[in-house]
Interface confidence: low
């Protein structure tokens, strides 16, 4: 019995831009070839338990097989590399989750309001849905001093943890980042006293 996975899928953490092509490879270990009396031509690729058509599969050499997907659209696919051994007994080699989505759009329409004596709330339009875990961070600074970052919980707004100083201009912008990219909004420059919400 083998004490490790029989091989690995690369990339191990696939994140693909929706609508693009993607290729993964499965590399079998030498010990696996000998243990199961197989080579890469015995590999069966599966997505969500369904066999991938042979025309999408290429045997690169005795240890390595590749699979190519065109126009990836599903948000999440369980991709597995399997081998047919000992008279068609299927053994799972390795499995990864392939995620697809979009890089973040440049956040737009950034606006902030100040709750008198309390805090400041900034809101923005994140653009299209990314379908991926996307972190939005509100950044702010005054002259050369940086204020603490504000990590957005919902992706469209953030309540800053500090009380902004009046009568000095601060610069505020949003950074959006996921596995496919990172982008910043245009910054806005204002005196917080001008953004006080009327009570």
């Amino acid at each position: 019995q083998l004490l490790e996975p029989c091989g690995y899928i690369y990339p191990e953490f696939p994140v693909v831009q929706r609508g693009s092509n993607f290729t993964a490879i499965c590399v079998l270990k030498e010990a696996c070839l000998q243990h199961y009396y197989v080579n890469a031509s015995y590999i069966v690729w599966k997505t969500n338990h369904a066999a991938v058509p042979r025309e999408q599969v290429t045997v690169i050499n005795r240890t390595t097989s590749s699979v190519t997907f065109t126009d990836v659209v599903l948000p999440s696919v369980q991709l597995t590399c399997n081998i047919l051994s000992f008279g068609q007994i299927e053994q799972n080699v390795y499995g990864v989750t392939m995620l697809s989505g979009f890089p973040p759009d440049k956040p737009t329409n950034l606006t902030c309001i100040v709750n008198e004596g309390k805090n400041m709330l900034c809101q923005w339009d994140p653009g299209r849905e990314t379908y991926l875990e996307t972190n939005y961070t509100l950044k702010s600074e005054w002259a050369t001093e940086k204020f603490p970052d504000c990590q957005s919980k919902h992706g469209t707004s953030c309540m800053v943890s500090y009380m902004p100083t009046y009568y000095v201009n601060i610069e505020v912008w949003v950074e959006a980042e996921n596995a496919l990219g990172k982008v910043s909004s245009e910054s806005i420059n204002f005196d917080p006293v001008d953004k006080v919400k009327p009570t």
Partner: nanobody, 114 residues
């Protein structure tokens, strides 16, 4: 801030059972496949098991198949590894990790010895 905190490791006799837990925070847990990996003394990281985001698909290394069961609770953002019929060769530090996120926890020590 992504955080993964394993617990449940212990000293256990061969043939015994343990249940490891991994509490996740700082990311949308249900979006991601999760996995357990382990590192035995003086060895490299070894993949143990993976589970899809919804929990419907599970995968195991040959060495643990039939003895270990991976599961998840997406309501409480927790990953589990039920380990039965433990063997001395299961002795290792066990880590949970999130697929597609370059993070893993600090690990929990499992020692199988008589």
């Amino acid at each position: 801030q992504v955080q993964l905190q394993e617990s449940g490791g212990a000293l256990v006799q061969p043939g015994g059972s343990l249940r490891l837990s991994c509490a996740a925070s700082g990311f949308t847990f249900s979006y991601y496949a999760m996995k357990w990996v382990r590192q035995a003394p003086g060895k490299g990281l070894e993949w143990v098991s993976s589970i899809s985001g919804g929990g419907g698909a599970t995968y195991y290394a040959d060495s643990v198949k039939g003895r270990f069961t991976i599961s998840r609770d997406n309501t409480n953002d927790t990953l589990y590894l039920q380990m039965n019929s433990l063997k001395t060769e299961d002795t290792a530090v066990y880590y949970c990790a999130a697929q597609n996120l370059d993070y893993r926890g600090q690990g929990t020590q499992v020692t199988v010895s008589s």
